[in-house]
């Protein structure tokens, strides 16, 4: 039986497809090809001989169709007005023609979306960051990928307005990365550039690691303090020290050669971040034995959490 | 107190290099990064990148990459900065300047600046 | 890279009058702004640094304000001494960027 198979069966806009014609009778003379679902002369694209391979086109030939001697038509830089059904007749020697319909569905072609957003330095726990992926076109499908992924399941993750929006409730440091939209019909798909989202977070409780050198575990007079803290923020925290509460540098590491009695305190790490307006510190006590005794670092280190 | 002394004046001609010092004194050199600046004649005040003395890392403002080399001499407090290919528009005053802590501080202390002259 | 422009380039005041001198950024700066003073002939100093902090020994009669990308150095009532160019800059990572400088002078 006479078949019409559309390759592609969705076309985007300006594109072309292919229909071919499958089982063609042995004893054909001729091919015409019409728009619609019927044979009708108005509706007529273009008939072909084959004894003299010769194609005529018809009242609906619009220039952009090509008939081929395997009866397949080519239609070129098609429109959503091509889309719907064609009817391939093939004329046989003995005047009984076949005829078969196919159809094909034309989709307009996709803009490349681009994002939105509302905020792309949320500060975490504080923030929610809306992301819409622009523009609005119908009978379009919107996916979302992060760093390259498809979206988690997460409940602070919410999509609406026919998934062109995607909303990250009270983010965290973990959602930061890379977001693309992308837009998707039938037969075409287009992805936007990444849009980075920085999520600014900490400064958070900071620790306080010793180095002794020596390096053994107590706090001997004579021995040289290396204290380093450490906070985890973004952007990276300001450093700076307190020895019994007066000020002292604003650096990462504290050090003192040469470490006596004198030097026994509390020594606090504070840490601020201007973009998240968070402040944290740590305080520790340290004693420094004259001799033989070693206390090190007291215990009861503690911190204290500003906002 | 805090000092940062800077190599004198240099005169280069276009296509040459040129190496500038500069010597930190009164506090711990590895603790804190030291940038460098230029200031052409009556211009103002130009990033060019700064050095970790600790670590030896560095970060280069995108017009001098690939041109200026920071190093370092924890043996004697020194920072180095090398500019190569040199013309006419290098001619500046340099200046080292110590950030006045660790990460996104401002320049709190600054050598005395060496003026290097591009001129054939 | 984040721009930086000051105004007015230059100004003429009277010895203790008021004066201002903006900054603005091109992106959100979070505070993270300095000012220097540069005396004819001198090396750059630092006067305020985290947009409003003064470092120590610098005049009480300068001082900082602004948030985000907006910010202003002000003398409360210039003097003889104050005659200089005056920079800002971002201290949020790098690459740091400079204003093009404030001249300030004595009418």
């Known amino acids: 039986k006479l078949t019409i198979e559309s390759t592609p069966f969705n076309v985007a806009e300006g594109k072309e497809v292919l229909l071919l014609a499958h089982n063609l009778p042995q004893n054909r003379i001729g091919y015409s090809w019409y728009k619609g679902e019927r044979v009708d002369g108005n509706s007529l694209i273009v008939g072909y001989v084959i004894g003299t391979q010769q194609a005529t086109p018809g009242p609906a030939y619009s220039g952009r169709e090509t008939i081929y001697p395997n009866a397949s038509l080519l239609i070129q830089n098609v429109t959503q007005n091509d889309t719907g059904f064609y009817t391939l007749q093939v004329i046989k020697s003995d005047l009984v023609n076949e005829e078969a319909t196919g159809q094909f569905h034309v989709y307009p072609e996709l803009p490349k979306p681009s994002i939105s957003s509302n905020n792309s330095n949320p500060v975490e726990d504080k923030d929610a960051v809306a992301f819409t992926c622009e523009p609005e076109v119908q009978n379009t499908t919107y996916l979302w990928w992060v760093n390259g992924q498809s979206l988690p399941v997460s409940p602070r993750l919410q999509l609406s307005n026919g998934n062109m929006t995607l909303t990250l409730l009270s983010v965290k440091r973990n959602d930061a990365g890379s977001y693309e939209c992308e837009i998707q019909n039938p037969a075409s798909a287009n992805r936007s550039d990444p849009v980075t989202l920085n999520v600014l977070y900490g400064p958070d409780v900071p620790t306080i690691s010793p180095i002794i050198s020596p390096p053994d575990s107590s706090y001997l007079s004579g021995a040289n303090l290396n204290l380093s803290c450490h906070s985890a923020s973004n952007p990276s925290p300001q450093y700076s020290w307190r020895i019994n509460g007066i000020p002292q540098q604003h650096t990462q590491v504290l050090f003192i050669a040469k470490i006596t009695p004198n030097n026994n305190g509390t020594y606090a790490c504070f840490v601020s971040n201007l973009a998240t307006g968070r402040n944290n510190s740590i305080v520790k006590s340290i004693t420094v034995s004259a001799s033989g005794t070693s206390p090190g670092l007291s215990a009861g280190a503690h911190h204290h959490h500003h906002h | 107190q805090v000092q940062l002394v800077q190599s004198g004046a240099e005169v280069k001609k276009p296509g040459a290099s040129v190496k500038v010092s500069c010597k930190a004194s009164g506090y711990i050199f590895t603790s804190y990064w030291l940038h460098w600046v230029r200031q052409a004649p009556g211009q103002g005040l130009e990033w060019i990148g700064y050095?970790?003395?600790?670590?030896?890392?560095?970060s280069y403002a995108q017009k001098f990459q690939g041109r200026v080399t920071m190093t370092r001499d924890t043996s004697t407090s020194t920072v180095y900065m090398e500019l190569s290919s040199l013309r006419s528009e290098d001619t500046a005053v340099y200046y080292c300047?110590?950030?006045?802590?660790?990460?996104?501080?401002?320049?709190?202390?600054w050598g005395q600046g060496t003026l290097v002259t591009v001129s054939s | 890279d984040i721009q930086m422009t000051q105004s007015p380039s230059s100004l003429s005041a009277s010895v203790g009058d008021r004066v201002t001198i903006t900054c603005r950024a091109s992106e959100n700066q979070y505070g993270y702004l300095a000012w220097y003073q540069q005396k004819p002939g001198k090396v750059p100093k630092l006067l305020i640094y985290?947009?409003?902090n003064l470092v120590e020994g610098v005049p009480s009669r300068f001082s900082g304000s602004g948030s985000g990308t907006d910010f202003t150095l002000t003398i409360s009532s210039l003097q003889p001494e104050d005659v200089a160019t005056y920079y800002c800059q971002h201290h949020l990572g790098t690459p740091y960027t400079f204003g093009q400088g404030t001249k300030v002078e004595i009418k």
């Open positions: 050095i970790n003395p600790q670590t030896g890392y560095t």
């Open positions: 985290n947009f409003k």
């Open positions: 300047a110590r950030e006045y802590g660790n990460y996104n501080y401002p320049l709190d202390y």
